[in-house]
Interface confidence: medium
């Protein structure tokens, strides 16, 4: 017996009625006395509703189910589920038995729209640029769990420092609270979008914050103009200073270091104490020098991924900020030179000379020269590959026709460190092998 149900889940809003469609094709002469119809929960086999011995046996499921009795004889075995709850979600099996037997399962997907988010700000008074605030976006009584996205006023995603929690109430409906921690700029719009993935329903809220500027003028924050260059694996100091006024105490100071582009928090000093590193526990302040206006940040065991711009925000009564660039570098190893072919070489032979130098950063510049210092630019192929640490291995290949004799040298330059590493190979006019045999 062929039993038909919808392939896609039946989506039902909490509190509404849902129809779980199920049908079969009755043969001529079919009467309801021959019909056994059973609806049950697919997983637990719990009885939901049944029609046997020619009559409706009623609901075994909280008295919230009904059959379409007037349509049963035409093969409509659908089940009506009233006042849908979250707990109803799942698979229901429709068993039909006449002389023969058939069954099929239909999925019920429960949903509830999320409310328009309410936005709250903490603190919400006397805000100044440079203050750290938490913006909370709350949306209620939705199902299933929501997806939450934050954006700035230009539509750019805000992904750093977001914490989202979702709590189900007794009915199984979720309240979602998403908290964005952000350092205020001169002004800004922050918006949160709460999506119900089943209903494809979006609820959004936004908040525009215009911090007050104090009339006394901004704090002047000083950082080096030039990038700070740091070797991979060493410690770097990102210098930042301000001029404290007479009577200044650390209790008045809010100091925040963050990544300029992503606004990710790196380190902070607020409420009179060091709040510690939010950046892989590799940062520290010079606490004994803070009161003198030294807001510098120490970054330990520098990695390639640290490269970029760091912003130093200083807020006392007023606010100031400045960005300092960190340029990461690593010296290239002395190049190793290989020759191919490397046996029985004669003038007129074409050879490839490979110059390899390892674990440098940033990408190298490679120059080839002959024995007189003249550049060799033709037939050079240079490739640079980064390893997991982001350090580059450089391989430069020179293809050349041997003269009577000649020296070929390769210079690998680190453009940041202005460090040159070079290697050379000398090929004489006699038949020879490389490297020369002892």
């Amino acid at each position: 017996l062929e039993v038909q149900v919808p392939e896609d889940p039946v989506v039902a809003l909490v509190g509404t009625d849902a129809t779980l469609r199920c049908s079969f094709s009755p043969e001529p002469g079919f009467s309801l006395a021959q019909l056994n119809l059973i609806w049950q929960l697919t997983d637990t086999k719990q009885l939901v509703h049944s029609f046997t011995e020619g009559r409706d046996q009623g609901s075994a499921y909280a008295n919230r189910t009904a059959l379409f009795l007037d349509l049963l004889a035409q093969g409509n075995a659908s089940l009506r589920l009233q006042r849908v709850r979250v707990a109803d979600e799942g698979s229901f099996t429709c068993f039909v038995s006449i002389r023969d037997f058939g069954s099929a399962a239909v999925s019920l997907q429960v949903a509830a729209p999320y409310s328009k988010p309410s936005m709250t700000l903490e603190p919400n008074k006397d805000l100044r640029p440079g203050d750290t605030v938490t913006i909370t976006c709350s949306s209620y009584r939705g199902y299933p769990e929501a997806e939450v996205f934050w954006q700035d006023g230009q539509g750019a995603p805000l992904t750093g420092n977001v914490t989202t929690s979702q709590m189900a109430n007794e009915q199984g409906l979720f309240d979602v609270h998403s908290v964005l921690r952000v350092v205020l700029g001169a002004n800004g719009t922050y918006s949160c979008l709460v999506r119900n993935p089943v209903l494809q329903q979006d609820a959004h809220g936004s908040i525009t914050i215009t911090p007050q500027r104090s009339p006394t003028g901004a704090v002047e924050v000083q950082v080096p103009e030039d990038p700070v260059v740091a070797l991979v694996g060493t410690d770097a100091t990102l210098r930042c200073s301000f001029s404290p006024e007479p009577g200044f105490s650390l209790a008045q100071l809010n100091l925040i270091w963050q990544l300029t582009d992503t606004k990710q928090l790196v380190h902070s000093f607020t409420e009179g104490r060091d709040q510690g590193s939010a950046y892989a526990n590799r940062t520290a302040l010079f606490l004994d020098l803070l009161a003198q206006g030294n807001a510098s940040l120490r970054l330990q065991r520098v990695r390639v991924a640290d490269e970029g711009s760091f912003t130093c925000f200083v807020s006392i009564r007023d606010f100031g900020s400045a960005a300092v660039s960190l340029q990461v570098a690593a010296p290239y190893s002395k190049p190793s030179m290989t020759l191919e072919p490397n046996k029985d070489l004669r003038p007129g032979d074409t050879v490839t000379i490979t110059c390899s130098s390892y674990r440098g950063y940033p990408e190298a510049e490679v120059f080839w020269q002959d024995g007189q210092g003249a550049p060799l630019t033709g037939n050079v192929t240079t490739s640079q590959m980064a390893n997991e640490q982001g350090l580059f291995d450089v391989h430069s290949v020179l293809r050349v026709v041997l003269g009577a004799n000649g020296t070929y040298s390769c210079l690998v330059r680190n453009p940041v460190l202005q460090q040159d590493a070079h290697g050379s190979v000398t090929i004489t006019g006699q038949p020879m092998t490389f490297p020369p045999e002892a």
Epitope: G153, G155, A156, P157, L193, D202, H204
Partner: antibody, heavy 121, light 106 residues
């Protein structure tokens, strides 16, 4: 009519730099961010970064960090994209595009006509 | 980085056919935009915010989806729809495009 008009085609040598301009008209230049997207011959679209002409805030795709500089001149409603240390793989059509919309939905609604940059020795 | 994978890469179709292009994101995104690019032209906005038609776009185009799976549908294809179609997200940095789906009219 809202328009973005880009500078003409450029032929450059490897290792050199190129600066492409994008002049906006028909709308308030400082109200929308300008993004730069490139397309290598026969390839898809690749985002390079954007600038907020009002605040001059920029954000770059990691791949171009350190090689691309985006600037904007409010007085002439012109955005600029400079790409340095050019290599042959940078041969592409470079587009500027206006990122428009309103919270929370945004999209590229106006594109420049594209500037072809050819890098060849 | 959220990677957008479009399928198919290429499709050859006859006029009046229905065409479906899918765009799958490597993690959940808030919405998807779609662009049409004809040879030697700049891209043009087609669908904004998953399902909203851009101004001047014929009603035979439609978009749907959520989470990680999004679809662009062209009902009753016309000859002028021969182009490459791209999906785009910016729910997470960096902004990314799909690799493109080229539609050829038979």
């Amino acid at each position: 009519e809202v328009q973005l008009v880009q500078s003409g085609a450029e032929v450059k040598k490897p290792g050199s730099s190129v600066k492409v301009s994008c002049k906006a008209s028909g709308y308030s230049f400082t109200s929308y961010t300008i993004h730069w997207v490139r397309q290598a011959p026969g390839q898809g679209l690749e985002w390079m970064g954007y600038i907020n002409p009002n605040s001059r805030n920029t954000d770059y795709a990691q791949k171009f960090q350190g090689r691309v500089t985006l600037t904007a001149d409010k007085s002439t409603s012109t955005a600029y994209m400079e790409l340095s240390s050019l290599r042959s793989e940078d041969t592409a059509v470079y587009y500027c595009a206006r990122y428009s919309g309103s919270t929370p939905y945004w999209y590229f609604d106006v594109w420049g006509q594209g500037t072809t940059v050819t890098v060849s020795s | 980085e959220i990677v957008l994978t479009q399928s198919p890469d290429f499709q050859s179709v006859t006029p009046k056919e229905k065409v479906t292009i899918t765009c799958r994101a490597s993690s959940s995104v808030s919405y998807m935009n779609w662009y049409q690019q004809k040879p030697d032209q700049s891209p043009k906005l087609l669908i904004k915010a998953t399902s909203n038609l851009a101004s001047g776009v014929p009603s035979r185009f439609s978009g749907s989806g959520s989470g990680t799976d999004f679809t662009l549908t062209i009902n009753s294809l016309e000859a002028e729809d021969a182009a490459t179609y791209y999906c785009q997200q910016w729910s997470s940095n960096p902004l990314t495009f799909g690799q493109g789906t080229k539609l050829e009219i038979k």
